[in-house]
Amino acid sequence: KNLKSPQKVEVDIIDDNFILRWNRSDESVGNVTFSFDYQKTGMDNWIKLSGCQNITSTKCNFSSLKLNVYEEIKLRIRAEKENTSSWYEVDSFTPFRKAQIGPPEVHLEAEDKAIVIHISPGTKDSVMWALDGLSFTYSLVIWKNSSGVEERIENIYSRHKIYKLSPETTYCLKVKAALLTSWKIGVYSPVHCIKTTVENELPPPENIEVSVQNQNYVLKWDYTYANMTFQVQWLHAFLKRNPGNHLYKWKQIPDCENVKTTQCVFPQNVFQKGIYLLRVQASDGNNTSFWSEEIKFDTEIQAFLLPPVFNIRSLSDSFHIYIGAPKQSGNTPVIQDYPLIYEIIFWENTSNAERKIIEKKTDVTVPNLKPLTVYCVKARAHTMDEKLNKSSVFSDAVCEKTKPGNTSK
């Protein structure tokens, strides 16, 4: 009896694992083995596919074959008993195009209200992704074990810290990788769970902000208790992208070591141009807080995000505010080539009740003012980029008196 060729051959590639699956074409024939050949582009001869010769099952692994993953290959299969079937040719494919990203490795560390997630590619030193290691981004799904309500976090790198969690609570999460440059989305990791610790005696510092004054950066934060000392550390933001490296060499800012106030001042030349992460820790001599949330600090934006300059035209019931480019030392205007949003705060000079206007335009009307009343105005600029989320300091307040009634034209 003539052997029939096997059918429906599937090629599954996950990371560096190459798996072939196929269907027997004749279940009634026993003791059949299967063998594959492969052919590279531009070659006429077929080569035996190692790992896939005389296979008794309907699955084989040819991961040991050192292929150029960017080069198209063709496979063929036949069944063998006493005689052999005809060859069945599989559609040619490029391994890299066909490959899926496998589940990443996930390593968790817990604090009282935060979890640190370290993510590594599932296959160490992968050949498939050798040129794409730094291009991996990850997304995760996290939920409280008790509730199951899921939160998705997109576009994270090999180290990510999740804050504002509840103490003594078990959180579960799963992570998948993506190579956006190649439109590839990976497979989720297994679910990993970790319990946050009991609440720490000392909370971490909060609301860290960086501003520029003269040639210095001013770093400010809030803290619950008095008589504390603080230290500040920085890290190059790109180091969070480094796959497989989970040693983070946070550096001390010398002028911000063991400071006793909730701010520190350090020269701008401490940092070269770039994007950094900053974090602050508090200590009372006996106990230490966990580190604060890490804030992103872009020297380019920070250096040039100066408070806006504005002019006020006073009417009886409103102010017209014209916002101009801030001035550098030397009175030259700063060119800001990224979109800004302006926050304008105004108040009656005799009162503390502040009102706020947020506006994208550079000419703003402040309505509903009383005639012949002194109002004060201050403004600051914010970048519209959510990730960087930078703000200038407020301008100095400018106070003006509204005109008498009926001068609104």
Epitope: H107, L108, E109, A110, E111, D112, H118, I194, T197, V198, N200, E201, N245, H246, L247, K249, K251, Q252, N286, N287, T288, F290
Partner: antibody, heavy 118, light 107 residues
Framework: EVQLLQSGAELVKPGASVRLSCTAS????????LHWVKQRTEQGLEWIGR????????KYAPKFQGKATITTDTSSNTAYLQLSSLTSEDTAVYYC???????????WGQGTSVTVSS | DIVMTQSQKFMSTSVGDRVSVTCKAS??????VVWYQQKPGQSPKALIY???YRYSGVPDRFTGSGSGTDFTLTIGNVQSEDLAEYFC?????????FGGGTKLEIE
């Protein structure tokens, strides 16, 4: 293969100084931290301090501030521990260790025995 | 400095038994704890990191647990080669500090 090879045993007089070395192979020390740990006979482990060989930044345990100085020579992939004003309390085995992923001291040298005696 | 206390200096066990070594931190250190094993005449070797992750090549009879201030190293099915001293260490805050060690004796 990752290895940390430490210099040989030292017998030194009280008040003197000593410099121990630790030569790394199988990795570039600039990519890691290097720590030094003290162990007295039949006693526990004490962390002395660490260095980032990339820029020479050091951290010390308060107890060893002024007593210990950690340096590196990146061209020879070597770390050094200098101990000054030695007393009998400094008699111990000193280990050099690599600070790797997750800040784990993942590889340890064989230890250098320092004996302070007149 | 954070004090790591291993209250039991010695523990006696038999081959095949299950034994737990404990360690207490003087303040919350999250899960930033490492366990080391030091066999007689040898250098220490990392066993468990981040409180519960087994270091590569470490047999699965070694498990770590705990968080905050209380940590445990458990050896299930103790083998004669587990005769050693076990140290915990916190890596939450400088200076890093070690526990005083627990010597495991095998009867």
């Amino acid at each position: 293969e990752v290895q940390l090879l430490q210099s040989g045993a030292e017998l030194v007089k009280p008040g003197a100084s000593v410099r121990l070395s630790c030569t790394a192979s199988g990795f570039n020390i600039k990519d890691y931290y290097l720590h030094w740990v003290k162990q007295r006979t039949e006693q526990g482990l004490e962390w002395i301090g660490r260095i980032d060989p990339e820029d020479g930044e050091t951290k010390y345990a308060p107890k060893f501030q002024g007593k210990a100085t950690i340096t590196t020579d990146t061209s020879s992939n070597t770390a050094y521990l200098q101990l000054s004003s030695l007393t009998s309390e400094d008699t111990a085995v000193y280990y050099c260790t690599r600070g790797g992923n997750y800040d784990v001291m993942d590889y340890w040298g064989q230890g250098t025995s320092v004996t302070v005696s007149s | 400095d954070i004090v790591m206390t291993q209250s039991q200096k010695f523990m006696s066990t038999s081959v095949g038994d299950r034994v737990s070594v404990t360690c207490k931190a003087s303040q919350n250190v999250g899960t930033y704890v490492v366990w080391y094993q030091q066999k007689p005449g040898q250098s220490p070797k990392a066993l468990i990191y981040s409180a519960s992750y087994r270091y590569s090549g470490v047999p699965d009879r070694f498990t770590g647990s705990g968080s905050g201030t209380d940590f445990t190293l458990t050896i299930g099915n103790v083998q004669s080669e587990d005769l050693a001293e076990y140290f915990c260490q916190q890596k939450n805050t400088y200076p890093f500090t070690f526990g005083g060690g627990t010597k495991l004796e095998i009867e």
